[in-house]
Interface confidence: medium
């Protein structure tokens, strides 16, 4: 007789979740020799331990601490790239600019990127049918708490000039409710971070507005300045051109300004 299982509003755990996490871990440690010391079986055990047998609306950051400890990794100063609502371009950028890193370029972010997972109270099963939705069910679910935990840590360890890529096509270019706005901004350490530089990515080809003057960017500037961190903003008018110029900086057409710089 099938057991009764809680029905959540969100999609269930990604198929072959354990295999995918282990495979990603092994691949990551092979590609990054500095992480060769990581035991992927222990990583999976710690990941599993964070949510298996636990009520999936009562997950805490504490649950993920063993995993966070195993995945400890540092980014060189000036090399952290945060992003909000523009993941694909941020990842395309770090794939070209190999010395800059988004959270998903780090072990723990890479393991979980685009995956969903949850368990259920008092059983060792993974729930492949449904998982809690952040809005409809609860915010303290395994996936949301994971990203909050690792995003906090990523921001806390950043140093030098930190960059953030923001989506200029959205009504709220800076959204206080995003992971960047609610977690990362507040966990940058003023004693280690000299400045935050925002790159506002334009969507339309003919869009020549100065989106650095957008009210939500002013709001971001205010929050950052109050935390004694300097703020800069750049318009990236042509993201395609921007990526092309990152790939081929010697290209003559790249010497002309592809962005506009604001110092504050």
């Amino acid at each position: 007789v099938p057991r009764w299982r809680q029905q959540w509003s969100g999609s269930g755990t990604t198929s072959r979740f354990p295999e995918t996490v282990l495979a990603r871990c092994v691949k990551y440690t092979e590609v990054h020799p500095e992480m060769r010391h990581v035991d992927c079986q222990s990583v999976w055990d710690a990941f599993k331990g964070a949510f298996i047998s636990k009520y999936p609306c009562n997950i805490t950051e504490e649950d993920y601490q063993p995993l966070v400890k195993l995945g400890t990794q540092t980014v060189p100063c000036n090399k952290t790239l945060l992003w909000s609502r523009i993941k694909d371009l941020a990842h395309q950028f770090t794939q070209v600019q190999r010395d800059m890193f988004t959270l998903e370029d780090m072990l723990l972010g890479y393991l979980a990127d685009d995956l969903t997972w949850c368990g259920e109270f008092n059983t060792f099963e993974i729930n492949y049918q449904s998982c809690p939705d952040w809005r409809k069910d609860c915010s303290n679910n395994p996936v949301s708490v994971f990203w909050k935990t690792v995003s906090r840590r990523f921001a806390e360890t950043a140093c030098g000039v930190v960059h953030v890529m923001l989506n200029g096509s959205r009504s709220k270019i800076f959204d206080k409710n995003s992971t960047f706005g609610s977690v990362e901004v507040h966990n940058l350490q003023p004693e280690k971070v000299q400045a935050l530089e925002a790159w506002v990515i334009h969507g339309g080809r003919e869009d020549s507005r100065d989106l650095c003057q957008d009210p939500t960017i002013k709001e971001l500037e205010s929050i950052i300045s109050k935390r004694n961190i300097r703020f800069f903003c750049k318009n990236i008018y042509r993201p395609d051109k921007f990526l092309q110029c990152v790939k081929n900086p010697e290209d003559s057409s790249c010497l002309s300004g592809i962005h506009h710089h604001h110092h504050h």
Epitope: E19, T20, L22, A23, V26, K27, E30, P33, R36
Partner: antibody, heavy 121, light 107 residues
């Protein structure tokens, strides 16, 4: 018993592309990395790149970056290696090989029979 | 990339004798080293991995040793079927790299 069966020999013109297939049977195709290794006539072995089918994200040796594309079709348990802009130096036997540990790219305990690719005008 | 150097290029040995093949890495590869045997017209065959662990079905006369940058493959008593080319391969750092091979021929 794991078997890797590769497609047949190819003769190609300089500047063209070649796509070699490697069909796996036995074992869980998705979880084991498939690598491609080539061997020019009378020469040693050269690793070109590999893929874990479950992840679908290949890794390439710098030398072949931009010229090689490695893919895997889980539904048919087949891996593919496509090499473009062929030149005479690409004449070689191309092997597919399977990593001996789950998820890991190496070392290689199962090998295909090899596919001879001849590049000649 | 890590350069693997094998020596000698050719080793002439009589059947029943001991053969010692060397492999040096340009930087440490820990114990992430494998040895392969290849006969003419055939695909390579895995002999040793982890520098010293014999692969399934490999006779006890084959043994591997070393770690870091210096490795050795020893064939304690050469049989006629052992005459072939032997390659070492590191799988510590991408890209995986092979040595140029040592040909073991009949003296």
């Amino acid at each position: 018993q794991v078997q890797l069966v590769q497609s047949g020999a190819e003769v190609k013109k300089p500047g063209s592309s070649v796509k070699v297939s490697c069909k796996a049977s036995g074992g869980d195709f998705s979880l084991y990395a498939i690598s491609w290794v080539r061997q020019a006539p009378g020469q040693g072995l050269e690793w070109m790149g590999g893929i874990i089918p479950l992840l679908g994200e290949p890794v390439y040796a710098q030398k072949f970056q931009g010229r090689v594309t490695i893919t895997a079709d889980e539904s048919t348990s087949t891996a593919y290696m496509e090499l473009s802009s062929l030149r005479s130096e690409d004449t070689a036997v191309y092997y597919c090989a399977r990593g001996h540990r789950v998820y890991s790219s190496s070392p290689f305990d199962y090998w295909g029979q090899g596919t001879l690719v001849t590049v000649s005008s | 990339e890590i350069v693997m150097t094998q020596s000698p290029a050719t080793l002439s040995v009589s059947p029943g004798e001991r053969a010692t093949l060397s492999c040096r890495a340009s930087q440490s590869v820990s114990s992430n080293l494998a040895w392969y045997q290849q006969k003419p017209g055939q695909a390579p065959r895995l002999l040793i991995y982890g520098a010293s662990t014999r692969a399934t079905g490999i006779p006890a006369r084959f043994s591997g040793s070393g770690s870091g940058t210096e490795f050795t493959l020893t064939i304690s008593s050469l049989q006629s079927e052992d005459f072939a080319v032997y390659y070492c391969q590191q799988y510590n750092n991408w890209p995986w790299t092979f040595g140029q091979g040592t040909k073991v021929e009949i003296k």
